[in-house]
């Protein structure tokens, strides 16, 4: 169950989609990454609130556990929901290869 | 790639599957739900320290990124990987029902 | 619309050379990375080259590495494939084709025959 | 490089039939599959990416699953202009490369 979408802390308080400008050395690829030299990486950024986007059945009980025991239990955890393709040109033993990556880009964010 | 299981933070500091007892009324589901009792809720909770137990790509993304710049990227994050079915014996509007639900119960964790 | 026109069709002999053209519209050329595709007369497709938008990154299936060399001209518009010592297998119907950036072909040309005989 | 195994070769359809062929990649793709058909004369078009989504205006009747190395096509009640080649291409990684094809043709 994807619950609410209104955030109570404000706009933009709550977990959503963000966008990190990071270049090949920011993320430790310089040495087997040729390109994009820089990449825009989409991740999940923000609180999770009771019942914000709730990603399932265990993010409900999460909450519940929290507000209970908030300093032996979590809050729910901003994380991907699903991911967009990236293709990496990168370095290989033999030269050169395009490689399709399925987990570099967050397309869309829940709580968990 | 779920990478290094050893925590450099010391035994049982880092992400790993943990036990919580919950109540009915603990969960908010008195009105709803009859049985069990009581729910031996698995949750995954603890630090994700660098490469500890890294979903993926993105895990080891933001990492970087948070190592980089932590007040705008948040470190990785312990949240299930996988999850345990637990049936409940629920009341419905004609008397009650046995619903099997897939993801109450983490399984095991890692760091996302 | 999106339209690329493959040119250069032709019969070569065996060692022979032949360069192929591709005229792309309706979409911003620069920005998309190309590859050509062949069907051969067995009606099986093959992967032949693939160029980044600028030019700077090119792979080729190793049945025509060294003998073919993919170009692009941004201002122009175009694509090329230069085909050189030319074999009888690489026979086929050649088709254009733009890459949105996941290695998958959404758009195709209509294709060039290309026919290597003695 | 990744082999695509294609099969069968030949499907033969009546029209309202539900159909699938597979395609098995010789190492782990994810779910980088690619499905087109193409039609005599015709340039091959693309239907499916993501070994599931369904390209702009393919009609649902088409749909793709599978990930790893196991992939299905299927249509679900096929129509006369239907009948065509199907290849399924993995972009995973270069080479890319394709399934030998699947001809569907009328009983």
């Known amino acids: 169950a994807r619950n609410g979408d209104h955030c109570p802390l404000g706009p933009g308080r709550c977990c959503r989609l963000h966008t990190v400008r990071a270049s090949l050395e920011d993320l430790g690829w310089a040495d087997w990454v040729l390109s994009p030299r820089e990449v825009q990486v989409t991740m999940c950024i923000g609180a999770c609130p009771s019942q914000f986007r709730a990603a399932n059945m265990h993010a409900q009980i999460k909450t519940s556990l929290h507000r209970l025991k908030p300093d032996t239990v979590p809050a729910p955890c901003c994380v991907p929901a699903s991911y967009n393709p990236m293709v990496l040109i990168q370095k290989t033993d033999t030269g050169v290869s395009l490689q399709t990556y399925d987990d570099l880009l967050a397309k869309d964010c829940h709580c968990i | 790639a779920r990478n290094g299981d050893h925590c450099p933070l010391g035994p049982g500091r880092c992400c790993r599957l943990h036990t919580v007892r919950a109540s009915l009324e603990d969960l908010g589901w008195a009105d709803w739900v009859l049985s069990p009792r009581e729910v031996q809720v698995t949750m995954c909770i603890g630090a994700c320290p660098s490469q500890f137990r890294a979903a993926n790509m993105h895990a080891q993304i933001k990492t970087s990124l948070h190592r980089l710049k932590p007040d705008t990227v948040p470190a990785p994050c312990c949240v299930p990987a996988s999850y345990n079915p637990m049936v409940l014996i629920q009341k419905t509007d004609t008397g009650v029902s046995l619903q099997t639900y897939d993801d109450l119960l983490a399984k095991d964790c890692h760091c996302i | 619309d999106v339209k690329l026109v493959e040119s250069g069709e032709g019969l070569v002999k065996p060692g022979g050379s032949l360069k192929l053209s591709c005229a792309a519209s309706?979409?911003?050329?620069?920005?998309?990375?190309m590859s050509w595709v062949r069907q051969t007369p067995e009606k099986r497709l093959e992967w032949v080259a693939y160029?980044?938008?600028?030019?700077?990154?090119?792979f080729y299936a190793d049945t025509v590495k060294g003998r073919f060399t993919i170009s692009r001209d941004n201002a122009r518009n175009t694509l090329y494939l230069q085909m050189s010592s030319l074999k009888s297998e690489d026979t086929a119907m050649y088709y254009c084709?733009?890459?949105?950036?996941?290695?998958?072909?959404?758009?195709w040309g209509q294709g060039t025959l290309v026919t290597v005989s003695a | 490089s990744i082999v695509m195994t294609q099969t069968p070769k030949f499907l033969p359809v009546s029209a309202g039939d539900r159909v699938t062929m597979t395609c098995k990649a010789s190492?782990?793709?994810?779910?980088?599959v690619a499905w087109y058909q193409q039609k005599p004369g015709q340039s091959p078009k693309l239907l499916i990416y993501?070994?599931?989504n369904r390209y702009t205006g393919v009609p649902d009747r088409f749909t793709g699953s599978g990930s790893g190395t196991d992939f299905t096509f299927t249509i679900s009640s096929v129509q006369v202009e239907d009948l065509a080649v199907y290849f399924c291409?993995?972009?995973?990684?270069?080479?890319?490369?394709f399934g030998a094809g699947t001809k569907l043709e009328l009983k």
């Open positions: 084709t733009r890459d949105d950036g996941y290695l998958w072909f959404a758009y």
């Open positions: 291409q993995q972009h995973y990684s270069s080479p890319l490369t």
């Open positions: 993501y070994a599931s």
């Open positions: 190492q782990n793709v994810g779910n980088n």
């Open positions: 309706g979409f911003t050329f620069s920005s998309f990375a």
């Open positions: 160029i980044t938008s600028g030019g700077d990154y090119i």
